[in-house]
């Protein structure tokens, strides 16, 4: 058993069919010695008496808010949560496996630039009695500070018969050094509590590996006189690191016909303009990637040819 | 470069960009193979990193690019020695068309651009001997290449910025 925060305790349960459970001794936080009784959750029924209460925790019903009382007055509370391990593996029932970029990916994180700011998100089908808390640092043995904001419900989607909820959090490295080569990874730790179930999820990454620029902005087409060709131009996204002479992007451009089956020629360029043949009903698209490190491509920015 | 002269920024830019391409073609499987394990915080200390105080940021380069260039050169020589060691030359043998050979030559080429003949900067010691098991060697190759990708990305940014803003 360990303390998650004041008056909240996590009982680690190594579960197998005939597991004996965990013996937990609760102590009433009071100088009083006599006339103390214990209750569980909202029930008025007395579970036991005395300054300590010993319980055998074997299933979720044994967890909950234990309160000690004297003369009808609550003296102290202890909320017991269960963290379940089965076959040597901690439970991951609360969050959905996003399976990208690999199996057992419960947290996904992205950064728009090298400023040390990043966003992580996760999915669940649970809609109520759910709380999250997030901690982050750079490195684990001698951690450097990362500050995370409040967790927010960022999206709701219907997936077949189920509703899926996306939660996200924004974090910022306290002393980011955008130009340096990262040596220690960022660690993100999410605590999830659903009813009386406690779970924790972690992710470890370098900012450079989670970079995904915003799409290029200001796409413009300028027809060239007496030609089927057009000059297309675009700009770095506002959110990308500066100066651009240092934090450079490379671009992938394509012209997509109306039919999805039509062959698309992709061209790669470091410039922010190109000359292409842009037929009527087609569209021109461009996406960006860090020029020197193969992290994710941005989403496409598109503009119709006509 | 030693003694304060300027490097051939444009040449360095071209070669460092080529290094980035080669480093990724040598080990493209980036997001799909998590090579970080327990204790990696210690093993990453073995390779030289371009750190915050090394003056490789745009402001540091404007003030005095020498600190940064020295750091980059140390790293290039370190990786050049690693790629020439039996970590890469031993079993399992690299494929004949492996980009590691080109990568090795380009590391050497760029380090020489930063130090013309006759000047010798001290460089870091080559790391401890290579592991004996082929599978360990393979894993170490991947780790070295991942680390090299990060190192040459910073070097390439430095030379791109230098070529754009510091060239005479």
């Amino acid at each position: 058993i360990w303390e998650l925060k004041k008056d909240v305790y996590v009982v680690e349960l190594d579960w197998y069919p005939d597991a004996p459970g965990e013996m937990v001794v609760l102590t009433c936080d009071t100088p009083e010695e006599d006339g103390i009784t214990w209750t569980l959750d909202q029930s008025g029924e007395v579970l036991g008496s005395g300054k300590t209460l010993t319980i055998q925790v074997k299933e979720f019903g044994d967890a909950g808010q234990y309160t000690c009382h004297k003369g009808g007055e609550a003296l102290s509370h202890s909320l017991l949560l269960l963290h379940k391990k089965e076959d040597g593996i901690w439970s991951t029932d609360v969050l959905k496996d996003q399976k990208e970029p690999k199996n057992k990916t419960f947290l996904r994180c992205e950064a728009k630039n090298y400023s040390g700011r990043f966003t992580c998100w996760w999915l669940t089908t649970i809609s109520t009695d759910l709380t999250f808390s997030v901690k982050s640092s750079r490195g684990s043995s001698n951690p450097q500070g990362v500050t995370c904001g409040a967790v927010t419900l960022s999206a709701e989607r219907v997936r077949g018969d189920n509703k899926e909820y996306e939660y996200s959090v924004e974090c910022q490295e306290d002393s980011a050094c955008p130009a340096a080569e990262e040596r220690l990874p960022i660690e993100v730790m999410v605590d999830a509590i659903h009813k009386l179930k406690y779970e924790n999820y972690t992710s470890s990454f370098f900012i450079r590996d989670i970079i995904k620029p915003d799409p290029p902005k200001n796409l413009q087409l300028k027809p060239l006189k007496n030609s089927r060709q057009v000059e297309v131009s675009w700009e770095y996204p506002d959110t990308w690191s500066t100066p651009h002479s240092y934090f450079s992007l490379t671009f992938c451009i394509q012209v997509q016909g109306k039919s999805k089956r039509e062959k698309k020629d992709r061209i790669f360029t470091d410039k922010t303009s190109a000359t292409v043949i842009c037929r009527k009903n087609a569209s021109f698209s461009v996406q960006a990637q860090d020029r020197y490190y193969s992290s994710s491509w941005s989403e496409w920015a598109s503009v119709p040819c006509s | 470069v030693p003694g304060g002269s300027s490097p051939a920024w444009a040449q360095c830019q071209q070669l460092s960009q080529k290094l980035c391409t080669l480093a990724w073609s040598a080990h493209p499987l980036v997001g799909h193979m998590d090579l970080r394990e327990e204790g990696d915080e210690e093993t990453t200390n073995d390779v030289p990193h371009i750190q915050c105080g090394d003056g490789c940021d745009p402001q540091g380069l404007r003030d005095n690019s020498q600190f940064c260039l020295q750091r980059i050169r140390q790293g290039l020589i370190f990786y050049e020695k690693l790629l020439g060691s039996d970590i890469f030359t031993g079993e399992p043998s690299l494929l004949p068309d492996s980009p590691v050979g080109q990568l090795h030559a380009s590391l050497l080429g760029l380090s020489q651009l930063l130090q013309p003949e006759g000047h010798h900067w001290e460089t870091q010691q080559i790391p401890s001997p290579s592991p004996s098991q082929p599978w360990q060697r393979l894993l170490l190759r991947f780790k070295i290449l991942r680390s090299l990708q990060a190192f040459v990305a910073v070097a390439a940014r430095v030379f791109a910025h230098g070529a754009a803003t510091l060239s005479p």
């Epitope: 579960w15 569980l40 959750d41 074997k58 979720f60 019903g61 269960l82 | -």
Partner: nanobody, 126 residues
């Protein structure tokens, strides 16, 4: 994925006693409460008793006569029935709830339970 098996039913004379057992297997860690319900012919299934950790609750009709208890080590719940009456004749069902209610009285509702046993017949002859 929780299995429940009742035993201990039978024929008993009015005023007599019986002890019912309910053995649970499968993913028993997910259980918040266990209960006993009964169904007499032509009647609705009704609540008898429930237990969660050390908490117990009973229907008014059995209070003081029936006792629900739990053997933690054996994953078994018991219903000790004393002073049996002919109106106690019914099929007795064991149930397990994997939903959490902070108000323990919610476990006296039939729809709070997710898993049910096959039932055991109790007949009280007068």
């Amino acid at each position: 994925e929780v299995q429940l098996v009742e035993s201990g039913g039978g024929l008993v004379q009015a005023g007599g006693s019986l002890r019912l057992s309910c053995a649970s297997s499968g993913r028993t860690f997910s259980i918040y409460a266990r209960g006993w319900f009964r169904q007499a012919p032509g009647k609705e299934r009704e609540f008898v008793a429930a237990i969660r950790s050390g908490l117990t609750t009973y229907s008014d009709s059995v209070k003081g006569r029936f006792t629900i208890s739990r053997d933690i080590a054996k994953n078994t719940v018991f219903l000790q029935m004393n002073s049996l009456k002919s109106e106690d004749t019914a099929v007795y069902y064991c149930a397990a709830a994997v939903n959490y209610f902070t108000d323990f009285t919610d476990y006296s509702k039939r729809d709070s339970y997710d898993y049910w046993g096959q039932g055991t017949q109790v007949t009280v002859s007068s």
